[in-house]
Interface confidence: low
């Protein structure tokens, strides 16, 4: 599923991401834009053999199990396939664990490079939330 900007903002808000660990909703929408272009089916292979999955490009080395990543920790205790669902519940729940891990949203390279320090509220402007 490819979400619309406001559609995703509403879904993320429903799942409790607005101001989760101090990060406003705009941060999460911005991260999703530059990680996956709002596509729940996005996958990208990394040079270490791990793969990033879903709308927030969650990594199989640490967070989910795809049966394909040697030494995977599966800290979110989910199959990576769950992160590709059009229902973003699994991605949101895992993202909450990631953002609580100490580095906050710096865990997402795209957020660090494209969203951090910018006007992230622009990503939810005009949305009926």
């Amino acid at each position: 599923k490819v979400f619309g900007r406001c559609e995703l903002a509403a879904a993320m808000k429903r799942h409790g991401l607005d101001n989760y660990r101090g990060y406003s909703l705009g941060n999460w929408v911005c991260a999703a834009k530059f990680e996956s272009n709002f596509n729940t089916q996005a996958t990208n292979r990394n040079t270490d053999g791990s793969t990033d999955y879903g709308i927030l490009q969650i990594n199989s080395r640490w967070w989910c199990n795809d049966g394909r990543t040697p030494g995977s920790r599966n800290l979110c205790n989910i199959p990576c396939s769950a992160l590709l669902s059009s229902d973003i519940t699994a991605s949101v729940n895992c993202a909450k664990k990631i953002v609580s891990d100490g580095n906050g949203m710096n865990a997402w390279v795209a957020w660090r490079n494209r969203c951090k320090g910018t006007d992230v509220q622009a990503w939810i402007r005009g949305c009926r939330l």
């Epitope: 089916q41 053999g49 394909r68 040697p70 199959p79 590709l84 669902s85």
Partner: antibody
Framework: QVQLQESGAEVMKPGASVKISCKAT????????IEWVKQRPGHGLEWIGE????????YYNEKFKGKATFTADTSSNTAYMQLSSLTSEDSAVYYC?????????WGQGTTLTVS | DIELTQSPATLSVTPGDSVSLSCRAS??????LHWYQQKPHESPRLLIK???QSMSGIPSRFSGSGSGTDFTLSINSVETEDFGMYFC?????????FGGGTKLEIK
């Protein structure tokens, strides 16, 4: 329940191409890798490669690059493998399987004869 | 590529015997090793995933053990329906590879 239904046996001439299909039912087709495996008597099982239908991502065994091409049609929950420039070495049973690192579900196999 | 060597190539047993099938990897694959059974003209069937995790519906007489490079599939008190080919497969790296198989036959 999860099922993978492959297309029927094929007899092809050397140099031709063939397209084998694998229809998936009983699970969310877009979110699991479909693997392709070759089996020839005396040669055991060989992994050809895999496709993730939802994104179209593909990974091939180097040995089969240029020989096999994977596609998937998410509207019909069907994965395809095309084999080109066929030779007698391509005569084998070809399986699709659902990939989770391990292969818990397999198609019934498609027998390809090149002669 | 990781090479998997299965031994013996053929194992002749009497129903009721207990047997062990070996799979040796050319380099360490942690526990990323899976076992399949295949009968003539049938597709492979997954018995054990990740070295020792039994699949649902698989009889309890099948068990797996090992780690690193040496792995074993054990069948406690073989039954007639157990005869066929057994393959191991690694998912530690690409390309995925299979062992050459062990044929379990009736003595």
């Amino acid at each position: 329940q999860v099922q993978l239904q492959e297309s029927g046996a094929e007899v092809m001439k050397p140099g031709a191409s063939v397209k084998i299909s694998c229809k998936a039912t009983g699970y969310t087709f877009t979110t699991y890798w479909i693997e392709w495996v070759k089996q020839r008597p005396g040669h055991g099982l060989e992994w050809i490669g895999e496709i993730l239908p939802g994104s179209g991502s593909t990974y091939y065994n180097e040995k089969f690059k240029g020989k096999a091409t994977f596609t998937a049609d998410t509207s019909s929950n069907t994965a395809y493998m095309q084999l080109s420039s066929l030779t007698s070495e391509d005569s084998a049973v070809y399986y699709c399987a659902r990939g989770d690192g391990y292969y818990g579900y397999w198609g019934q196999g498609t027998t390809l004869t090149v002669s | 590529d990781i090479e998997l060597t299965q031994s013996p190539a053929t194992l002749s047993v009497t129903p009721g015997d207990s047997v062990s099938l070996s799979c040796r990897a050319s380099q360490s694959i942690s526990n990323n090793l899976h076992w399949y059974q295949q009968k003539p003209h049938e597709s492979p069937r997954l018995l054990i995933k990740y070295t020792s995790q039994s699949m649902s519906g698989i009889p309890s007489r099948f068990s797996g053990s090992g780690s690193g490079t040496d792995f074993t599939l054990s069948i406690n008190s073989v039954e007639t329906e157990d005869f066929g080919m057994y393959f191991c497969q690694q998912s530690n790296s690409w390309p995925r590879t299979f062992g050459g198989g062990t044929k379990l036959e009736i003595k």
